[in-house]
């Protein structure tokens, strides 16, 4: 049957019917339902929510809804032995202790099982020593400390402010610098927007608020004990000493009231420049150690958290395709939260719930999508993207043969200013065309398209008249699908104004104050931004699952490949002498990119002209489009990161959240002037150029005429 025969409404009306069925009021109701108690991964509460979602998705009309479970390594504080940090005097007496919990928000005082702030997967330990302030603990911050200021962090406890980069990268950098412990804190400069009140009177972080989060460096491995394979009942598990990505030094997060107490006594070197100074009334001295009369005082960490293998549950719903049931379009977002999950993840889960309900309504009226749609409620995302990764590992053979696209659905909002999209270039045209058809929810843009308000508020830095679309990095559940399996992926959410709000993430991220009321009172009272995000995510899924020809444009990959080749070449040309000495040439890569450009244009011409009524031809062309993303996968993976296999994109080695283009070449070039053996280092650059060249050329060939 053709797609239109599988339905009693015409295709154009289907999309409209689907979008019209999405209701802000329902999203609001679902968000409220999902945020009344904590849903920490591995807990009974989160298992119950999984069963509730399973039951409701069945009611909504999906063909099947299953729970899939895995036994993965999770981490929890010791309930009887709390984690804290103290300042101790020369006699070893604790003269200051950090708080043991966040003051709960009004109305939530009697809620049980609020996990106190902790850094998940921190080892146990009670290191003591002098403090060194390391700014954001980025690679460049440690370069400044060690190379310019000649400050040695070896044997020291470092204190770093949250923001700019993924916290796991901060911990890794501190470990490499020889630190014995890490204290993470939220500086008001990053988590307190000027002119806005603290929660519960506004959306700013109070002094007692703390950001939880995992501090792993998994590099896409999933469960630390079963890298590459699902954590099922017969899985072989590594010992803790061989586990992937675990930190080796104790780590603990604190709020800015407690940080003030630690930082106000700091002595030693002054901060190198204003970029190292936050908004607290402290000198932001780097240390090491406390000043003058406090110089005999030390800092001591008391960390007693435990890591244990725990059962987690994904919910997987299926809406079978009428024409191509063996082609999967996946919409997935996580369900587990640190506490109430008012934004992360339940603002996303509520949107997924409403999308499922709308698809279910269409199905009940006799419609089916052309391709199969899979809906997923992932568990243990907060503990390292574990639920999605284990499921993808278990189903990797099916996914790499049948996976058309993955749309991520974590937090729907991180602000209420404009749209934010990260996706594969294959989806650029899909996103642009869809947003031109949707109405903007923004004030001052009544009757205008979402595309128009998005372009005005977030213009592309390179291409005028178009909105910005960013590269996919990681830190969310699309990682395994895109970076490991090469399935075309995208994500969309409403965001803040990055020009005027310099704070990192949103202030109450991963704190106890991330509640339903936060969203309902301050971010989206009418739930209009949630509705818009539902329309974008749902619209993308609809088009990917229902359009006769896949809505991918390979020409847009050609455009970005040219841009990325130019960029990496310009980076390498900062070393013209070495390029000459070691005969480093990018000619082959530029040639491959040109070939890709030419073949992509010819493919697009064939795509326009071929007989769409011929099912074999149609399937052939669609398969070439589906497998293009897959063609960028190197089965050997990136150096020391075997689960990051995409040659064009990978999470930055210095910030998991950010995407890097031509990551193999980029990493080979990074800090190359400091390498002990330049000949070997430039040899690796050449090797990476050859891998990139081969991959781009091979991807181009997949678009050539098949015979």
């Amino acid at each position: 049957k053709s797609s239109s025969e599988a339905t009693n409404i015409t295709p154009k009306h289907n999309m409209k019917a689907f979008l019209d069925e999405l209701k802000a009021e329902n999203i609001k109701k679902f968000l409220h339902n999902f945020t009344q108690i904590p849903h920490l991964a591995g807990t009974e509460q989160n298992f119950q929510l999984a069963k509730q979602i399973q039951s409701q998705w069945k009611e909504f009309g999906l063909d099947s809804v299953e729970l899939t479970h895995y036994d993965v390594l999770l981490s929890y504080p010791n309930k009887t032995h709390p984690n804290y940090i103290s300042i101790i005097n020369e006699d070893g007496n604790e003269i200051f202790n950090t708080s043991l919990f966040e003051p709960p928000p009004a109305g939530y005082e009697n809620v049980s099982d609020i996990v106190p702030p902790f850094s998940a997967f921190s080892p146990q330990g009670m290191p003591e020593g002098d403090l060194v302030y390391v700014n954001y603990a980025r690679t460049e911050d440690f370069f400044k400390l060690e190379r310019d200021m000649k400050i040695n962090c070896s044997g020291k406890i470092v204190i770093a402010r949250y923001g700019k980069v993924f916290r796991g990268n901060k911990v890794k950098n501190a470990q490499l610098a020889g630190a014995t412990g890490v204290i993470l804190y939220s500086d008001p400069d990053d988590y307190f927007a000027p002119g806005v009140k603290s929660y519960p009177d506004g959306w700013n972080l109070p002094g007692g608020g703390v950001q939880r989060g995992n501090i792993l460096n998994l590099n896409g491995a999933g469960d630390p004990l079963t890298p590459g394979y699902p954590a099922n009942e017969y899985a072989y598990r590594r010992g803790m000493a061989e586990a992937v990505g675990l930190p080796s030094i104790p780590v603990h997060p604190i709020g800015y009231y407690d940080a003030q107490k630690l930082l106000e006594k700091m002595g030693g070197s002054a901060s190198p420049d204003s970029s190292w100074r936050g908004s607290l009334k402290v000198p932001y001295n780097v240390g090491p150690g406390f000043t003058g009369n406090f110089s005999t005082q030390k800092v001591k960490m008391h960390i007693h958290s435990t890591s244990e293998v725990t059962r987690i549950y994904n919910v997987i719903g299926t809406l079978r395709g009428a024409v191509e049931p063996d082609r999967y379009v996946i919409l997935g977002g996580h369900r587990d939260s640190w506490v109430f999950g008012g934004i992360d993840p339940q603002s996303g889960a509520a949107v997924v719930h409403e999308i499922v309900r709308s698809f279910g309504m269409l199905k009940k009226e006799g419609w089916r999508p052309r391709r199969t749609i899979l809906f997923a409620s992932w568990d243990a995302e907060e503990f390292g993207l574990l639920g999605s990764t284990e499921w993808a590992e278990e189903n990797s053979r099916l996914l790499q043969e049948r996976g058309v696209a993955y749309i991520n659905a974590d937090s729907s909002i991180e602000g209420n200013y404009t749209l934010r999209v990260d996706c594969t270039p294959l989806m650029y045209s899909l996103v642009y065309n869809l947003t031109k058809e949707l109405e903007s929810p923004d004030e001052g843009f009544e009757g205008k398209s979402l595309y128009e308000s998005w372009t005005k508020k977030s213009p592309s830095p390179e291409f005028s008249g178009m909105p910005r679309i960013s590269k996919l990095g990681s830190g969310n559940d699309f990682e395994v699908f895109f970076q490991r399996l090469g399935i075309a992926s995208g994500r969309a959410r409403y965001t803040k104004n990055w020009e005027t709000n310099k704070f990192s993430s949103y202030p109450l991220y991963h704190s106890v104050y991330e509640t339903y009321e936060l969203v309902e009172k301050f971010y989206d009272p009418m739930f209009k931004y949630h509705l818009t995000v539902a329309q974008v995510r749902g619209g993308m899924v609809f088009e990917l699952a229902n359009s006769v020809v896949l809505p991918f444009d390979c020409r847009d990959y050609a455009v970005v490949l040219r841009k990325y080749a130019d960029k990496i070449y310009n980076i390498s040309m900062k070393h013209p002498q070495e390029m000459k000495t070691y005969s480093v040439s990018f000619d082959s890569l530029f040639s491959a990119v040109k070939n890709f450009t030419e073949i992509a244009s010819k493919f697009s011409e064939r795509l326009r002209d071929f007989d769409k009524s011929n099912p074999i031809l149609l399937r052939m062309m669609n398969d070439q489009l589906m497998f293009l993303e897959r063609a960028f996968i190197d089965p050997l993976g990136l150096p020391d990161r075997p689960f990051y296999r995409h040659v064009i994109y990978a999470p930055s080695s210095h910030n998991k959240y950010a995407g890097e283009s031509f990551p193999g070449i980029y990493d080979a070039l990074f800090d190359i002037e400091s390498k002990v053996d330049p000949s070997q280092a430039w040899g690796e650059v050449k090797r990476q150029i050859s891998i990139a060249t081969f991959t781009v050329q091979a991807a181009a060939e997949t678009l050539s005429e098949v015979a």
Epitope: Y432, F463, A558, Y569, N570, P576, T597, S601
Partner: antibody, heavy 121, light 111 residues
């Protein structure tokens, strides 16, 4: 046979605006980058702007950035150049040119006959 | 001032050979493909050479192109009076993200 026909040139005062069009035929318009190249009287060629195939990413010469906007309508096989805040030094014959490779600019295998823009008070 | 440097003029007698140089930098000619265009008086430019050394169909093999390092050269053998024109080199510049041209070379066929 590939054809590119420019139109919309003329006399305009400094500070004024003009919109040039280029009607394309004989090839799959949407798959190729398109450029505007100009030539001041008695001078050499100067690339002005390009727009990629596909979604239409745009590129501009520094001399026109912020003043000129390139756009295309693939359904109409038409390329445009909106020129605002025109200056005397923008006086030139403006050529529309098709890329010979694909979605980004490499070389120009076909050129239009040109349209003259005169900026003068 | 053009990004690519060409001699303003060259001349030779009919039947002779002439070369026109085009000098750039590592970010343009050094890494990208060079094309050459012929502009006869009063007409639009015409593609003569692309991808450093390839000729479009219809361009006689008297015209040739080469590239070495950050320079490119257009060669014309068996000069004819009909070759009298302006010649431009062009390429992409990876630092500027822009197409760049040479200032043009006026070829005069003597006699």
């Amino acid at each position: 046979e590939v054809q590119l026909v420019e139109s919309g040139g003329g006399l305009v005062q400094p500070g004024g605006s003009l919109r040039l069009s280029c009607a394309a035929s004989g090839f799959t318009f949407s798959s190729y980058a398109m450029s505007w190249v100009r030539q001041a009287p008695g001078k050499g060629l100067e690339w002005v702007s390009a727009i990629s195939g596909g979604i239409g990413s745009t590129y501009y010469a520094d001399s026109v950035k912020g003043r000129f906007t390139i756009s295309r309508d693939n359904s109409k096989n038409t390329l445009w150049l909106q020129m605002n805040s025109l200056r005397a030094e923008d006086t030139a014959v403006y050529y529309c040119a098709k890329d010979g490779v694909g979605a980004t600019p490499y070389y120009f295998d076909y050129w239009g006959q040109g349209t003259l823009v005169t900026v003068s008070s | 001032q053009s990004v690519l440097t060409q001699p303003p003029s060259v001349s030779a007698a009919p039947g002779q050979k002439v070369t026109i140089s085009c000098s750039g930098s590592s970010s343009n000619i050094g890494i990208n493909y060079v094309s050459w265009y012929q502009q006869l008086p009063g007409t639009a430019p015409k593609l003569l050479i692309y991808d450093n050394n390839k000729r479009p169909s219809g361009i006689p093999d008297r015209f040739s192109g080469s590239k070495s390092g950050t320079s490119a050269t257009l060669g014309i053998t068996g000069l004819q009076t009909g070759d009298e024109a302006d010649y431009y080199c062009g390429t992409w510049d990876s630092s500027l993200s822009a197409v760049v041209f040479g200032g043009g070379t006026k070829l005069t066929v003597l006699g």
